[in-house]
Amino acid sequence: QEEDLPRPSISAEPGTVIPLGSHVTFVCRGPVGVQTFRLERDSRSTYNDTEDVSQASPSESEARFRIDSVREGNAGLYRCIYYKPPKWSEQSDYLELLVKESSGGPDSPDTEPGSSAGPTQRPSDNSHNEHAPASQGLKAEHLY
């Protein structure tokens, strides 16, 4: 029972410009019925999976990926992909996370929302097993 899967979306809370040491949560969204969401970092070389999916609306699922204490090394491009049996979706647009030194002064700019688009690439369908591993040839490293 094949169906066309809509591309997921990605956002960040409270935004995409995060002070060093603060927290950020990436929110991935897709259709109802998603089994696994994956947050990929910089061309799929590292990723985190979750099957802890919840409803975002009557027509959407979501998953949340939290980084408790942002480091400079967390800056970069992130995107989402999901698995709804029997296949993977395309990737979302990229979201760029910027990490700034926390000056803490009254003139510090507020955290800004925003995103930057990037290319998408479909993973090979035969790369999937029940636990949604990385595509073949990639090391299963964690984002944080």
């Epitope: 109802v32 089994q35 979750t50 099957e51 409803q55 998953a63 029940e130 636990h131």
Partner: antibody, heavy 117, light 107 residues
């Protein structure tokens, strides 16, 4: 192979306590939400409790019928989920199933809890 | 809480026939609905998720339809092993409520 094995059921008196355990294997336990569902003899299914993963701060949810009496918890290092049941009532008599994730694809075989004087 | 009203409570049918079970949600749940089969003495088995998607390994004679508040579950060409109990469940919001069940009986 995904396995969910419940244990800890038995006979207990009204107002008594019991702790159920569910041992999970064959999947990435720590990224899944886990649930308990029960079924009284000859009756339908009733969702009891749910615990989310670390990425969702181990949030817990309960059916109104068990709120303030039952507590769901988990140990990711041991791939275990628990249901602590206090102040048990005769209407809590049921088969208790451990169930994985949001869409209830995987169920354990169940453990029977009988509350009777 | 969202109530799930499942009907009929029981239904008699013959081998090879088709049957339809309905489930009504007390408020809109989009397509956050699942259908389960339960054989006597066994754990339930997921058949349909997201209202219309067939779970892995489930025969294509099972199907689901609907969205919002009204949902249907159909078994076409009943086989001997299909004469068991079926439940709907909403997963839109906690508590994750089930319908009361439908028992299929051989006519």
């Amino acid at each position: 192979e995904v396995q969910l094995v419940e244990s800890g059921g038995g006979l207990v008196q009204p107002k008594g306590s019991l702790k159920l355990s569910c041992a999970a294997s064959g999947f990435s336990f720590n990224i899944n939400a886990m649930n308990w569902v029960r079924q009284a003899p000859g009756k339908g299914l009733e969702w009891v409790a749910r615990i989310r993963s670390k990425s969702n701060n181990y949030e817990t949810y309960y059916a109104d019928s068990v709120k303030d009496r039952f507590t769901i918890s988990r140990d990711d290092s041991e791939s275990m989920v628990y249901l602590q049941m206090n102040n048990l009532k005769t209407e809590d008599t049921a088969m208790y199933y451990c169930v994985r994730s949001l869409w209830f694809v995987y169920w354990g075989q169940g453990t029977l809890v009988t509350v009777s004087a | 809480d969202i109530q799930m009203t499942q009907s009929p409570a029981s239904q008699s049918a013959s081998l090879g026939e088709s049957v339809t079970i309905t489930c009504l949600a007390s408020q809109t749940i989009g397509t956050w609905l699942a259908w389960y089969q339960q054989k006597p003495g066994k754990s339930p088995q997921l058949l349909i998720y997201a209202a219309t998607s067939l779970a892995d390994g489930v025969p294509s004679r099972f199907s689901g339809s609907g969205s919002g508040t009204k949902f249907s579950f159909k078994i076409s060409s009943l086989q001997a092993e299909d004469f068991v109990s079926y439940y709907c469940q909403q997963l839109y919001s906690t508590p994750l409520t089930f319908g009361a069940g439908t028992k299929l009986e051989l006519k």
